[in-house]
């Protein structure tokens, strides 16, 4: 008989069995070649095995599927569609599997999929319908509540002739399928900006991680509708100042904790409102660590220790007085 998972530990399929069973329909609790399975834990791990495609013979009991550290390259439509369907699959981790293309409907027929991790894949081509599965203006709601997309930016020479931010946002917003999403991680993606409509259409977000990007400004981003937001990670970006509108929106969110460490804050006259806010707000975590990066004379000064006299702007000289 084919190897099955034991009740208490992971079992591995011997690679030589793969060809022997590939011609027949998979047995219900079979473990795919190059994978480890635990029926007790409802878990299948196919990790660091250089797989080039998703195993077809995944056991129907699988609830947690790890396909990390492989060489999948492309995730086609219905990559996880099986008969009978993988009705229990709730957590799918595909990180670090050299995916560069995720096609429309790649995650269709996974009715229980709540957590998806595509981190550390150079996604040059993420279909707008990767998560919604259809190009209808309003799709069936996705069951996803957690979507991890950290470091999915491809090298510059592999990017399509379009905005990477735009490609990702199109996938997040297509068909309004992700209205139930609670956690979204987009760290380390070289984002220069956040398209203004993205947050308004993800009203259920509890946790948003935008750390280690290149965001310069939040002026056109609205957080007002994110009334459930509990954590907002903006560490390690290129933020220079937060303006009054943003400060008011953040201050009004009932559950929020904001993380702002390691941004190149510009401590000139435009920073006065933010400093005033920081001195009184309780929503910024570790606010005593925030320091100025510019101008040079202010470098490393702690924002909380500044007063209005410190925050000046050089006067703009009339043209007749400017030197070349």
């Amino acid at each position: 008989s084919s190897p099955t998972s034991s009740a208490s530990s992971f079992s591995s399929s011997a690679p030589f069995l793969a060809s022997a069973v590939s011609a027949q329909p998979p047995l219900p609790d079979q473990c795919p070649a190059l994978c480890e399975c635990s029926e007790a834990a409802r878990t299948v791990k196919c990790v660091n095995r250089n797989l080039t495609e998703v195993p077809t013979d995944l056991p129907a009991y699988v609830r947690n599927l790890f396909l990390t550290g492989n060489q999948l390259a492309v995730l086609p439509a219905g990559a996880f569609a099986r008969r009978p369907p993988l009705a229990e699959l709730a957590a799918l981790n595909l990180s670090g599997s050299r995916l560069d293309e995720v096609r429309a409907g790649a995650f269709e027929h996974l009715p229980s999929l709540r957590q998806l991790d595509l981190s550390h894949n150079p996604l040059a081509d993420l279909s707008p319908f990767a998560f919604s599965g259809s190009n209808a203006s309003v799709s069936a709601p996705s069951p996803l509540v957690e979507l991890i997309l950290n470091h999915i930016v491809p090298p510059e020479d592999e990017r399509q002739n379009r905005s990477f931010e735009g490609m990702v946002v199109a996938a997040l917003l297509a068909g309004r399928a992700l209205q139930g999403l609670r956690r979204l991680e987009l760290a380390s993606n070289h984002f220069l900006y956040l398209p203004r409509d993205v947050l308004a259409q993800l009203p259920s977000l509890r946790h948003l991680d935008l750390s280690n990007n290149s965001l310069v400004s939040l002026t056109y981003v609205s957080f007002r509708n994110l009334t459930h937001l509990e954590s907002l990670h903006l560490e390690d970006n290129a933020l220079k100042v937060l303006h009054n509108g943003t400060l008011a929106e953040l201050q009004g969110l009932p559950h929020i904790r904001v993380f702002l460490d390691n941004n190149p804050w510009v401590c000139d006259c435009h920073m006065a409102d933010m400093v005033t806010w920081l001195k009184e707000t309780e929503v910024v975590q570790g606010k005593d660590r925030l320091t100025c990066a510019y101008p040079e004379k202010m470098r490393n000064r702690v924002l909380l220790e500044l007063n209005s006299a410190d925050l000046d702007c050089d006067p703009i000289l009339p043209p007749s007085l400017q030197t070349s």
Epitope: E230, N244, L247, A248, Q251, G252, L253, P254, H255, I256, R257, F259, W277, E280, T281, E282, V283, Q285, G286, K287, D288
Partner: antibody
């Protein structure tokens, strides 16, 4: 389900000390500011103080009426909030409530314990 | 410290009728566009329960007959149709500044 359970109240003589505990469950304790509020018999509510969360270094703020006498602390490994009360006075007699601040602490307390009675009398 | 003054001190009510309680602050409790003013109900023998936060947001699980309004220094809690279970003492609280302070309370009782 968020739960807060106070303990440690009782009868104590003026000038003595007492430590109240509040055991929390049902949420990530380190993420939240925690506070103590008291209510003298037949009177209104009085804020005693709070202790900040991990992100803000577990620093504390106290009301003027208890400053220098009462200390708020927390054991995050056990999810327990403490109120160390020294140099107790008869006017400290009250039901002491432990309360959790909302994620944005500016919106104050969203969950309260059932309270523990402290009676300071000779 | 910010002083909160509640009125009336006592409010006899008839079930099914509306009721209104006022809370006035000695200085503004607004900060960056939000008024940090809460309303709590303490039923007899129980701990306080949050009804309204941020002046007008109804806490999850609180019946929609409760509503809060106001900004700056003047605030109102309204009960559209009082029910027997609404009796108790109502407190307003400001969390704009440390120390946080409470109003003296309004006792709502059935006529």
């Amino acid at each position: 389900e968020v739960q807060l359970v106070e303990s440690g109240g009782g009868l104590v003589q003026p000038g003595r000390s007492l430590r109240l505990s509040c055991t929390a469950s049902g949420f990530t304790f380190t993420d939240y500011y925690m506070s103590w509020v008291r209510q003298a018999p037949g009177k209104g509510l009085e804020w005693v103080g709070f202790i900040r969360n991990k992100g803000n270094g577990y620093t504390t703020e106290n009301s003027a009426s208890v400053k220098g006498r009462f200390t708020i602390s927390r054991d995050n490994s056990k999810s327990i909030l403490y109120l160390q009360m020294n140099s107790l006075k008869t006017e400290d007699t009250a039901v002491y409530y432990c309360a959790r601040y909302r994620g944005n602490p500016h919106y104050a307390m969203d969950y309260w314990g059932q309270g523990t009675l402290v009676t300071v009398s000779s | 410290d910010i002083v909160l003054t509640q009125s009336p001190l006592s409010l006899p009510v008839t079930p099914g009728e509306p009721a209104s309680i006022s809370c006035r602050a000695s200085e503004s409790v607004e900060f960056y566009g939000t008024s940090f003013l809460q309303w709590y109900l303490q039923k007899p023998g129980q701990s306080p329960q949050l009804l309204i936060y941020g002046a007008s947001n109804v806490e999850s699980g609180v019946p929609d007959r409760f509503s809060g309004s106001g900004s700056g220094t003047d605030f109102t809690l309204k009960i559209s149709r009082v029910e027997a279970e609404d009796i108790g003492v109502y407190f307003c609280q400001q969390s704009r500044k440390v120390p946080s302070t409470f109003g003296g309370g309004t006792k709502v009782e059935i006529k």
